[in-house]
Amino acid sequence: IWELKKDVYVVELDWYPDAPGEMVVLTCDTPEEDGITWTLDQSSEVLGSGKTLTIQVKEFGDAGQYTCHKGGEVLSHSLLLLHKKEDGIWSTDILKDQKEPKNKTFLRCEAKNYSGRFTCWWLTTISTDLTFSVKSSRGSSDPQGVTCGAATLSAERVRGDNKEYEYSVECQEDSACPAAEESLPIEVMVDAVHKLKYENYTSSFFIRDIIKPDPPKNLQLKPLKNSRQVEVSWEYPDTWSTPHSYFSLTFCVQVQGKSKREKKDRVFTDKTSATVICRKNASISVRAQDRYYSSSWSEWASVPCS
Amino acid sequence: RNLPVATPDPGMFPCLHHSQNLLRAVSNMLQKARQTLEFYPCTSEEIDHEDITKDKTSTVEACLPLELTKNESCLNSRETSFITNGSCLASRKTSFMMALCLSSIYEDLKMYQVEFKTMNAKLLMDPKRQIFLDQNMLAVIDELMQALNFNSETVPQKSSLEEPDFYKTKIKLCILLHAFRIRAVTIDRVMSYLNAS
């Protein structure tokens, strides 16, 4: 058993049929010695008396808020949560496996630049009685500070019969140098509590590996005289690290017909313009990627050919 | 990338082209190592990230873009002395910091070159003959060093009398390639920045 926060404790349980429960001794936080009684949750029934209460925690029915009282006055509370371990593996019932980039990916994180700011998100089908708390650091043995905000519900989607909820959090490394070469990964730890179930999820990454630039901005077309060709121009996104001559991007320019089946023409360039043939009803899209470290491509920025 | 890239003209800055070749070569070598050594811990998640140049050179600090010198987190200054006569400077007037920067890059390349050559000698003794260092990568390191044209003492190649542990050597190769790729990215950024200055 360990303390998650003040008056909230996590009991770790081996979750197999013939596992013995965990013996837990609750102590009433009071100088009083006698006349103390214990209750659970909303029930007024006395579960035991005395300054300590020894319980066996085996089921979610044994978890909850234990309260000690004296003469009708509440003395202290202890909320017990359960963390299940099945076949040596901690349960992951609360969050959905996003399966990207690999199986057992519960947390996904992205950074728009090298400033040390990043966003992580996760999915769940649970809509109520759900809380998250996020901590992060650079490295784990001698951790350096990363500050994370509160996790918020960022999207709701309908997937078949189920509703899916996306939560996200923003974090910022306390003293980040955009040019630094990372040798210790960022660690992100999410505590998830659903009713009386506790779970924790972790992700470890280098900022360089989660870079995904914003799409190029100010995408414009300039027709070339007496030609079907157009000059496409764009700019670096505002959120990209500066100076751009140091943090350079490379670009992919794509001409896409109205039908998805039509052949796509693609050109790669390090410049912020390109000359392409603009077909009728086609659209031109441009996306960006770090020029020197191949992390994710940005989403496309698009304009119609007409 | 699977399609032709419109590469910019290296312009006046002769080292830019070499640094681009270097990054391409080390990235290819790392990819080859990860495929060949698929049953070894050779991915970024699995290896320990060691920097053989730590406390010996300070490339990131010495080559920091001017715009980032206001960022206190980037000013992790280290007292390191460097030789300051390089030919990549072309005909430009360059600051002492730029000379320090290129000198630091040269020292990095020299250290990695020694490590890779020592390692290759060990890998050539492996009866499995599983993996060797790409000669192209070693040649590209050499070319960039020559383009930088710094005079510095030659570091003797390390020789080991004991029987090499091939498993450890291959893991060390992965560690070295990961670290060198990160440094090659920094070098490429620096060359691009200097080329634009």
Partner: antibody
């Protein structure tokens, strides 16, 4: 006052189905799991299983798994035990009981439902 | 599963006497053992939990002791209403199991 009131005695033929009930009152129904115990004529007590009234989480005695089904209706604070096809060997007194949280024993019991299966 | 063996199977005693019933487990159940009393035609009633804790409303003449594999239920001075069948039950490991019962009869 805590009370567990069980449905009346049943006489059934082999192969028939049956659902007996246990209605709780006088306490917070969702705080306490409900269990079932069998007592064959002239025999001792046998633990069938327990069930959470919150989310219908169930722990069956392997000996009874597949033979009986436990269920619960939170809105009426009622627990059920049912058989899809009775056998003569199911003849017994069935007790529902309230599981004490933080312990696991049964602190309050229903009066029992006698089930007789005979052709 | 854990087997609980009660002894004796039948105990004859007179009111006012001390009665002791034993319960032995086939493996340790820590202190997670309860005692119940059942009278003819009635449902069982909880007497003792956690091996030695008296259920509220139960007279103090009933007491329990033991831990691990050996447990005892003691009635210090028998009253006429105490003559019944007594069961021990372990609730350490699923499936929870009961002893076969001890009949306490009037001598």
């Amino acid at each position: 006052e805590v009370q567990l009131v069980q449905s009346g005695a049943e006489v059934k033929k082999p192969g028939e189905s049956l659902k007996i009930s246990c209605q709780s009152s006088g306490y917070s129904f969702t705080t306490y799991w409900i269990g079932w115990v069998r007592q064959m004529p002239g025999q001792g007590l046998e633990w069938i299983g327990i069930m959470s009234p919150v989310d219908s989480d169930i722990r069956y005695n392997p000996m009874f798994r597949g033979q009986v089904t436990m269920s619960v209706d939170k809105s009426s604070s009622t627990a059920y035990l049912q058989w899809s096809s009775l056998k003569a060997s199911d003849t017994a007194m069935y007790y529902c009981a309230r599981r004490r949280p933080g312990q696991g024993y049964f602190d309050f019991w229903g009066q029992g439902t006698m089930v007789t299966v005979s052709s | 599963e854990i087997v609980l063996t009660q002894s004796p199977a039948t105990l004859s005693a007179s009111p006012g006497e001390r009665a002791t019933i034993s319960c032995r487990a086939s493996q340790s159940v820590s202190s997670w053992l309860a005692w119940y009393q059942q009278k003819p035609g009635q449902a069982p009633r909880s007497l003792i939990y956690s091996a030695s804790n008296l259920q509220s409303g139960i007279p103090a003449r009933f007491s329990g002791s033991g831990s691990g594999t050996d447990f005892t239920l003691t009635i210090s001075s028998l009253e006429p209403e105490d003559f019944a069948v007594y069961y021990c039950q372990q609730y350490n490991i699923y499936p929870y199991t009961f002893g076969q019962g001890t009949r306490l009869e009037i001598k």
